[in-house]
Interface confidence: medium
């Protein structure tokens, strides 16, 4: 265990000090705003945390450029279909960048969940999960949008969530 061993030890110690950015945000009663904006998230309580990423008005803000696995799950459910429901529900992760005026689609899914209601039971459940690796620059933001957000069920922070970690 000569110089090479102590060099490896030094590298290991340095790596342990370089915290890999990661965040897991959870659904809360305040998530649904009705304003047409992105979903808002709990950042501290329960399972939620931020490490090496920041949060602002529903957005995860990247402080360190790199490749990130970003993900979001939303639990959908209801009794019958809400008035005014579009034929499909869109759940998406979108990027905001200072270099472009509009949000950019990163990952998007669509479904028509209300069809799961039956004549014998108007209660229905569905969910949507998105996840993928994208490159993000420092200062760029990622948000979650659901149209129609009225279908999102929040309950206890385990059903609807949003997160990212550097890979």
């Amino acid at each position: 265990d000569g110089p090479a061993g102590s060099w490896e030890q030094l590298i290991q110690e340095r790596r342990s000090h370089e915290v890999n950015p990661a965040a897991h945000l959870t659904g809360a009663n305040s998530s649904l705003t009705g304003s047409g904006g992105p979903l808002l998230w709990e950042t501290q309580l329960g399972l939620a945390f931020l490490r090496g990423l920041s949060y602002h008005d529903g957005a995860l803000v990247v402080t360190k450029a790199g490749y990130y696995y970003i993900y979001s799950k939303v639990q959908l459910g209801g009794v019958g279909c809400p008035l005014g429901l579009a034929s499909t529900i869109t759940h998406g992760l979108y990027k905001r960048t200072p270099r472009y005026p509009e949000e950019l689609e990163l990952l998007v899914s669509q479904q028509s969940p209300c069809g799961r209601a039956t004549s014998s039971s108007r209660v229905w459940w569905d969910s949507s999960f998105l996840g993928g690796v994208v490159h993000l620059e420092a200062g760029e933001e990622v948000v979650v949008r659901v149209l129609d957000e009225r279908l999102v069920r929040l309950r206890d922070g385990t059903r609807s969530y949003f997160g990212a970690f550097m890979v």
Epitope: G78, G80, L83, G84, A86, V123, R155
Partner: antibody, heavy 121, light 111 residues
């Protein structure tokens, strides 16, 4: 603050139609359902139906389907309820009410002042 | 349609005493841990006013002497200490499915 202001009282003959308006202010009109509820003199409350101003989608109590027409004008933030083929038992106060944002719990958190519609020959 | 039956039809309570109104639904109005039952107060010549939503949530600006409880098919509105201004008709309403229906109303008076 949220306000719903309804049109004035109407007197109509049997067989005629009536159109009641409900002008909304103080909130995003296209994000909340507008419900219509009526109350006959000395009686309880009866739900007629609702309109979603965002796209004009409607839901009706089967009892009123075919006679009631609910619409909304986004440009003026006004909802309308038209009731046709009026009969004496339609004499009532008609209320518009804002439905809660969360569709699975359609409670009515703000109400108009009511419009008395009298049907009499 | 879901039928809501309130009891009693009328209630006379002394000032400062507790008033309790019951509402029974013809089927469960529960979904995902919430009960879709709401309560309104209506005074003569006025529109109804929301008091309690989803069974137990107090609407903002409503005095905390009003409370709601229950689940499934059985619900209760309680006024813990009746005040003169509480004289009104009280209605339960289900928002579980349309057509949304109301109870027949309970008239609360001062004894």
């Amino acid at each position: 603050q949220v306000q719903l202001v309804q049109s004035g009282a109407e007197v109509k003959k049997p067989g005629a139609s009536v159109k009641v308006s409900c002008k909304a202010s103080g909130y995003t009109f296209t994000s909340y359902n507008v419900h219509w509820v009526r109350q006959a003199p000395g009686q309880g409350l009866e739900w007629i139906g609702a309109v979603y101003p965002g796209n004009g989608d409607t839901s009706y109590n089967q009892k009123f389907k075919g006679r009631a027409t609910l619409t909304a004008d986004k440009s003026t933030s006004t909802a309308y309820m038209e009731l046709s083929s009026l009969r004496s038992e339609d004499t009532a106060v008609y209320y518009c009410a804002r439905g809660s944002y969360y569709y699975t719990s359609s409670y009515f958190d703000h109400w108009g002042q009511g419009t008395l519609v009298t049907v009499s020959s | 349609d879901i039928v809501l039956t309130q009891s009693p039809d009328s209630l006379a309570v002394s000032l400062g005493e507790r008033a309790t109104i019951n509402c029974k639904a013809s089927q469960s109005v529960d979904f995902d841990g919430d009960s879709y039952m709401n309560w309104y107060q209506q005074k003569p010549g006025q529109p109804p006013k929301l008091l309690i939503y989803t069974a137990s949530n107090l609407e903002s600006g409503i005095p905390d002497r009003f409370s709601g409880s229950g689940s499934g098919t059985d619900f209760t509105l309680t006024i813990s200490s009746l005040q003169a201004e509480d004289v009104a008709v009280y209605y339960c309403q289900q928002s579980y499915e349309d057509p949304f229906t109301f109870g027949q109303g309970t008239k609360v008076e001062i004894k």
